[in-house]
Amino acid sequence: KSPIFGPQEVSSIEGDSVSITCYYPDTSVNRHTRKYWCRQGASGMCTTLISSNGYLSKEYSGRANLINFPENNTFVINIEQLTQDDTGSYKCGLGTSNRGLSFDVSLEVSQVPELPSDTHVYTKDIGRNVTIECPFKRENAPSKKSLCKKTNQSCELVIDSTEKVNPSYIGRAKLFMKGTDLTVFYVNISHLTHNDAGLYICQAGEGPSADKKNVDLQVLAPEPELLYKDLRSSVTFECDLGREVANEAKYLCRMNKETCDVIINTLGKRDPDFEGRILITPKDDNGRFSVLITGLRKEDAGHYQCGAHSSGLPQEGWPIQTWQLFVNEESTIPNRRSVVKGVTGGSVAIACPYNPKESSSLKYWCRWEGDGNGHCPVLVGTQAQVQEEYEGRLALFDQPGNGTYTVILNQLTTEDAGFYWCLTNGDSRWRTTIELQVAEATREPNLEVTPQNATAVLGETFTVSCHYPCKFYSQEKYWCKWSNKGCHILPSHDEGARQSSVSCDQSSQLVSMTLNPVSKEDEGWYWCGVKQGQTYGETTAIYIAVEERTRGSSHVNPTDANARAKVALEEEVVDSSISEKENKAIPNPGPFANEREIQNVGDQAQENRASGDAGSADGQSRSSSSKHHHHHH
């Protein structure tokens, strides 16, 4: 007896598709070994058609795939555009050759069945309506018209022209004629359910001269679309319910044993399990809408249904669409922290993954907002300027080629707590959700800038120092000048080789930046930060105001902007100081300068893919240098 198991008999019709699941024993070897689907020939040889090693035969090209689900110990063979030539004996199996463990599957593909000529077949989906056409001879024009539904013994009236209506069809059935045509009447039945399926007879007149027509009404439950998605990726349910429900509330629900539990609807209901990672977007006036879920979890797998009803809840007899979502744990999307913790006044550096094959794609960071249908306004992007309320405290550092970009947010407040999305205008699966938690700071920040009253005088020399703790000693320190296009790191050089020191004096570790001479363009936000290679750590921000030399004191009170310019986080930082001038770049308006919403995957900015590198030092003529002060006792 084979330990592999699957369906012994599979049948379908031409043009349709099959999805064959094969089950294998739960062992590590089985999970990782080659899976195959082969066709048995008369000689007993089994010819591979598709395998998990990437092999795909010519006859399956463009119409089949094989997906392994190691967490379920199954693999699935999907075959589309079936023809009668696909009828035959197959094996699904495991092993390096086709003589390994296998299971026999018989596939039969038949022609679309012919229907008897005297029966008119209407095929409709659940929730839709049908209009049955009933022709009759002119002599039966004055006679009673009716539609009845066949039961075992009799034909039960649905509706007739004397306005009799079966109770189960009240409000759903209408009998009418069009214009002056006296040779046909129509019966419309709306909000179709499974119970409406069956054989009907429409009749005009009585006795042997009556006109009769047989009708076969097939009411189909929608066939679920199979969606295969990776863990941590995103999925979009595209729901197209038709114009007749365009003005009704829309919903997406997930089926459990007894009911379909609403996950989100357009009336504001949302399942807490999907907080921060779901959006519902009405698309147009034709009843089309989409639901996007990011950060897919194993437990998100299951049967989903979308629909429309004024209550925003599933209702029998209303149109629906269904999906079966599979979540594959063999994910290409790296496992990153989904919760990032910061403290008030501090900073966070969030590493956002993207598809490494799309390094030139535009990168974005948006804040998920749950009000209404949910939306995600873009806060920063490679070609999108930073939103005004984030001035001086938010930047995106693109590191082309390594599959990660970094978003840094400093001067944190408790109002920054919430959900944020990393996304690009490329591969929509690589959309990740991060929850930012902000606690009240309980200690001094790790990085501190002096003087805090940062007002520089035009034409003079101005130095600011960034004090860092010993734990950041080995890390790279940097200063950067912030603009709404990013924070441009100022090139640095060491002033003399680093000296080793037995002790590290907490009070003397600093990196200084000097503006010499100060110009009006030097006014603005500067960040002091630490990083290790491409991994960014803590930052602190300071606003440097520039004013003309006046008689008397050359310093004025610090701007309010510096009140928030401190940082605290358990990460590590860097050391450098600056002189010379920076070439000023005129910012380009980003793709979301006006339309700053990422509401839907498909509608996303497919702008040119030139990547504006917010983290580069291109065009900078300013330099910074590292100074290490050691106190010897």
């Epitope: 044993k257 049967h303 079966q324």
Partner: nanobody, 126 residues
Framework: EVQLVESGGGLVQAGGSLRLSCAAS????????MGWFRQAPGKEREFVGA??????????YYEDSVKGRFTISRDNAKNTVPLQMNSLKPEDTGVYFC?????????????????WGQGTLVTVSS
């Protein structure tokens, strides 16, 4: 809610035939799986066969011991899943249950099914 009702059980001689039927009512969906299981006195419920469908495609599964003797099918119009049992043996005796699910799971496992009928007794005498 989905209700399942089995019928067609009874006493039959070895070598004879019986046709069981599982009728489904309530919520129905485009893809569905229904499985037949049997339970002999003092034993665990064991898999007999299953059928699942999606659109025009149908998938049939059988336990090795019944393959070639039992046939599972689906009557669309009546919303039933009959199990035709031929060449019955005394070891086929037991209470036959049908289970239903909307999910794609291993049809051999009782845990795969969300709904169950009350069962119908089949006795095969020698």
């Amino acid at each position: 809610e989905v209700q399942l009702v089995e019928s067609g059980g009874g006493l039959v001689q070895a070598g004879g035939s019986l046709r069981l039927s599982c009728a489904a009512s309530g919520r129905t969906f485009g893809s569905y799986s229904m499985g037949w299981f049997r339970q002999a006195p003092g034993k665990e419920r064991e898999f007999v066969g299953a059928i699942s469908w999606s659109g025009s495609s149908t998938y049939k599964y059988y336990e090795d011991s019944v393959k070639g003797r039992f046939t599972i099918s689906r009557d669309n119009a009546k919303n039933t899943v009959p199990l035709q049992m031929n060449s019955l043996k005394p070891e086929d005796t037991g209470v036959y249950f049908c289970g239903g699910t909307m999910e794609r799971r291993d049809p051999r496992r009782t845990s795969a099914y969300d709904y169950w009928g009350q069962g119908t007794l089949v006795t095969v005498s020698s």
